[in-house]
C-alpha cells in the first residue's frame, strides 16, 4: 500500500524504463539491447 505517485517528471526507473515505456540502450547489455513493451510489462499487459 504505497501512496500514488506523481507522474509528471520524466526519467528512467531502476530497470531503465522510461515512465512505463520500453527503453532502447545498447551500452553494457549482453542479453537484450532493445526491449519490447512485453519485456517491461510482465503480467500486467500479458494477462498471465
Amino acid at each position: 500500500t504505497i501512496q500514488g505517485t506523481n507522474r509528471s517528471s520524466k526519467g528512467r526507473s531502476l530497470i531503465g524504463k522510461v515512465d512505463g515505456t520500453s527503453h532502447v540502450t545498447g551500452k553494457g547489455v549482453t542479453v537484450e539491447t532493445v526491449f519490447s513493451v512485453d519485456e517491461f510489462s510482465a503480467s500486467v499487459l500479458t494477462g498471465k
Epitope: 504505497i2 505517485t5 506523481n6 517528471s9 526519467g11 528512467r12 526507473s13 531502476l14 530497470i15 531503465g16 524504463k17 515512465d19 512505463g20 540502450t25 545498447g26 551500452k27 553494457g28 547489455v29 542479453v31 537484450e32 526491449f35 512485453d38 519485456e39 517491461f40 510489462s41 510482465a42 503480467s43 500486467v44 499487459l45 500479458t46 498471465k48
Partner: antibody, heavy 122, light 111 residues
Framework: QVQLVQSGAEVKKPGASVKVSCKAS????????FHWVRQAPGQGLEWVGW????????HFAQKFQGRVTMTRDTSISTAYMELSRLRSDDTAVYYC???????????????WGQGTTVTVSS | QSVLTQPPSASGTPGQRVTISCSGS????????VYWYQQLPGTAPKIFIY???QRPSGVPDRFSGSKSGTSASLAISGLRSEDEADYYC???????????FGGGTKLTVLG
C-alpha cells in the same frame, strides 16, 4: 503479505560458483522485476543486475557480465542468481529485491529479501 | 569510488533538520529518477523515497526528497534517535546502462 525469502549462508573456495535463491510470496511472481544487489562487509550497496521473471530477460552491470547468471522458476515463484569464478572480493551479503515498477507505476526496489551471506575463502 | 557522491557521515541532535546530498552527472541524476534507501544496522535496505520526492506509506513525513540538476538531497526534519542509519541514493545511469548507488551516508543522532 509480500515477502522475499532467500537461501542460507554459503562458504565457497576461490574459483567455485555459488547459486543464491529468492522465493517470492504474497503477490504475482511474474508481475515484477527482480534486482540483485550485494554489499561487501562494511561497504556500500552494489547493483548486480535484474531479471524479468515473466520473460526471463536479464540485464547485468558491466562488471559482472560473463560471470553472473540470473534465472527463475515460475512454478515455485523463485529467482536465482549464480556467480561463477568466485574471488575473495566477492565476499558479501547478496540481496534480492523486487522492483515495484510496472506498466503504470514506479516504486523502486520496494521489497527486499533478508540477504544471503556468501564467504569466499581458501 | 561511486558514480554518485554522498558525504560519508552526517549528524545532528534530536529535533534538528539534517540534509544528505547525492551528487551525480548528466547521465544519471540529470535525467533519471532518484531513489533513497534507509539501512538500519544488520538489516536489508528499505525504500524511503522514490521518484525523487515521493514517500511510501509508512515513511514519516519528516523525510523529504528533492532533485535539482545533477544533484539530489534527502532532508530529515525533527531528527529522532531511530533515524540513525545508513542512507543510500540510487539512480539509473544511461551511460553505464545500469543502476548506480551512492557510497552511503552514516547518520548519527547525537545526545
Amino acid at each position: 503479505q509480500v515477502q522475499l525469502v532467500q537461501s542460507g549462508a554459503e562458504v565457497k573456495k576461490p574459483g567455485a560458483s555459488v547459486k543464491v535463491s529468492c522465493k517470492a510470496s504474497g503477490y504475482t511472481f511474474t508481475g515484477y522485476f527482480f534486482h540483485w544487489v550485494r554489499q561487501a562487509p562494511g561497504q556500500g550497496l552494489e547493483w548486480v543486475g535484474w531479471i524479468n521473471p515473466n520473460s526471463g530477460a536479464t540485464h547485468f552491470a558491466q562488471k559482472f557480465q560473463g560471470r553472473v547468471t540470473m534465472t527463475r522458476d515460475t512454478s515455485i515463484s523463485t529467482a536465482y542468481m549464480e556467480l561463477s569464478r568466485l574471488r575473495s572480493d566477492d565476499t558479501a551479503v547478496y540481496y534480492c529485491a523486487r522492483d515495484g515498477s510496472n506498466w503504470n507505476r514506479d516504486y523502486g526496489m520496494d521489497v527486499w529479501g533478508q540477504g544471503t551471506t556468501v564467504t569466499v575463502s581458501s | 569510488q561511486s558514480v554518485l557522491t554522498q558525504p560519508p557521515s552526517a549528524s545532528g541532535t534530536p529535533g534538528q533538520r539534517v540534509t544528505i546530498s547525492c551528487s551525480g552527472s548528466s547521465s544519471n541524476i540529470g535525467i533519471n529518477h532518484v531513489y533513497w534507501y534507509q539501512q538500519l544496522p544488520g538489516t536489508a535496505p528499505k525504500i524511503f523515497i522514490y521518484r525523487n520526492n515521493q514517500r511510501p506509506s509508512g515513511v514519516p513525513d519528516r523525510f523529504s526528497g528533492s532533485k535539482s540538476g545533477t544533484s539530489a538531497s534527502l532532508a530529515i526534519s525533527g531528527l529522532r534517535s531511530e533515524d540513525e542509519a545508513d542512507y543510500y541514493c540510487a539512480v539509473w545511469d544511461d551511460s553505464l546502462s545500469g543502476v548506480v548507488f551512492g557510497g552511503g551516508t552514516k547518520l548519527t543522532v547525537l545526545g
